[in-house]
Amino acid sequence: GTDSGSEVLPDSFPSAPAEPLPYFLQEPQDAYIVKNKPVELRCRAFPATQIYFKCNGEWVSQNDHVTQEGLDEATGLRVREVQIEVSRQQVEELFGLEDYWCQCVAWSSAGTTKSRRAYVRIAYLRKNFDQEPLGKEVPLDHEVLLQCRPPEGVPVAEVEWLKNEDVIDPTQDTNFLLTIDHNLIIRQARLSDTANYTCVAKNIVAKRRSTTATVIVYVNGGWSSWAEWSPCSNRCGRGWQKRTRTCTNPAPLNGGAFCEGQAFQKTACTTICPVDGAWTEWSKWSACSTECAHWRSRECMAPPPQNGGRDCSGTLLDSKNCTDGLCMQNKKTLSDPNSHLLEASGDAALY
């Protein structure tokens, strides 16, 4: 065939795209009624010709809806927004086990779309803790477990622990560990962990404090080393000696136990008695010497000093002038300037 050059027309022209099903830009969120304040539930959808709330399977009255409409800037599509209020009374009037719930239903020419269910609950926090922490006295460096079960609440209460009114942060002090069931663990109790601990439970309704648990970290006393033995009480013969120690290694702290046992020990001792030295009798005088003196001696041997006894006091040798024997006095004259030395030497001790 021949090509006429003319374009073949389609059997049908494409029509404008069909309007899609509604899409929720905002779905209703779970909410809690605090005291008597009603909650607002809100929906936004496009494209939407209508949006209505259904609560617990029943349509909410049209009069209870607040509706707004506008254009979405990005798409140019018609956006519809609707909100309702749910009061405490409405929630309380719902019988049965299921929670009060609401969802949105949006319409477009393509059909309907349902939002998620939003649950409305009455918030509360009971007054009494299911379990409160108990005070403890623990030795230094030991583990401590403080338990806390918060009061029942909706929403479930969050728990934090206070140490002397300061919030404990286990990421800052790794000696603390918090568990999912709200226990507080002190890994190794330090003296600085002696404190008042309080479990605090809080939700959107209230904040509750447990009774305060006092943790006392104590140190049991330990003995120092024994001191040296004292000298024997008697210088001579049987006596006593003692030694002491103190409960200071470490000293008891925060009610820790005092050291068990004796702070001092006593034992018998025997010291060998000292014997003081005494002189023997003087020996006989020696013959008169050429220097006109004669001598005598004695010894510290009657008895000798023993076991630390005192030495003899006095002289070993004694001398005095003499004129007999070998004395050469006739050679000396009265005018001899050294003649006085002989007389004076009578007291001299020669060694």
Partner: antibody, heavy 115, light 106 residues
């Protein structure tokens, strides 16, 4: 020196019972949490149960709840694991460990559940 | 229960290598994560507690860190005695361990 020594393991038939002991020395068990951890042959570690005597606190893994009981005799400084209604899947080396940090462990005792 | 997903399950490395093992918690566990080393036929040994605190007596080449629910054990320079299996463990909820990472000689 801190030491933990387990004992009481052995061969037992399914449905049978066994009591494991963990004798502690070098510290006062009353002031520490004690834990049992098991390890099946060629497998990883699995926590079984915990006790903290001072607070009378006990806790169990779901897999042993109702069958196993953890206890401690502080006068003997010993922790126990009473295992009843034993199953083949309880076959493992059982370790006891001290404190939440599990800083000290025993050498383990083998429990074999088999017919 | 809280799951601890540990990776890799095994790795080959040489002496002197820098080794990193990670654990991801299925939900927040605060910083309540410990790391243990276990050698065949032996009991586990504590290395790190509270995510990043080095246990006394453990060499400083071991370190731990946390980023949200991700926890990391790092061995800065692998030594011959470090070839073993490593486990993470969380103690925020009922204790759970990771599956373990076996560090083998390349």
């Amino acid at each position: 020196e801190v030491q933990l020594v387990e004992s009481g393991g052995g061969l037992v038939q399914p449905g049978g019972s066994l009591r494991l002991s963990c004798a502690a020395s070098g510290f006062n068990l009353y002031y520490y949490s004690m834990h049992w951890v098991r390890q099946a042959p060629g497998k990883g570690l699995e926590w079984v149960a915990s006790i903290y005597s001072y607070s009378s606190y006990t806790s169990y893994a779901d897999s042993v709840k109702g069958r196993f009981t953890i206890s401690a005799d502080t006068s003997k400084n010993t922790a126990y694991l009473q295992m009843n209604s034993l199953r083949a899947e309880d076959t493992a080396v059982y370790y006891c460990a001290r404190s939440y940090a599990m800083d000290y462990w025993g050498q383990g005792t083998l429990v074999t559940v088999s017919s | 229960d809280i799951q601890m997903t540990q990776s890799p399950s095994s790795l080959s490395a040489s002496v002197g290598d820098r080794v990193t093992i990670t654990c991801r918690a299925s939900q927040s566990v605060s910083s309540a994560v410990a790391w243990y080393q276990q050698k065949p036929g032996k009991a586990p040994k504590l290395l790190i507690y509270s995510a990043s605190s080095l246990y006394s007596g453990v060499p400083s080449r071991f370190s731990g860190s946390r980023s949200g629910t991700d926890f990391t054990l790092t061995i800065s320079s692998l030594q011959p005695e470090d070839f073993a299996t490593y486990y993470c463990q969380q103690s925020y909820g009922p204790f759970t361990f990771g599956q373990g990472t076996k560090v083998e000689i390349k």
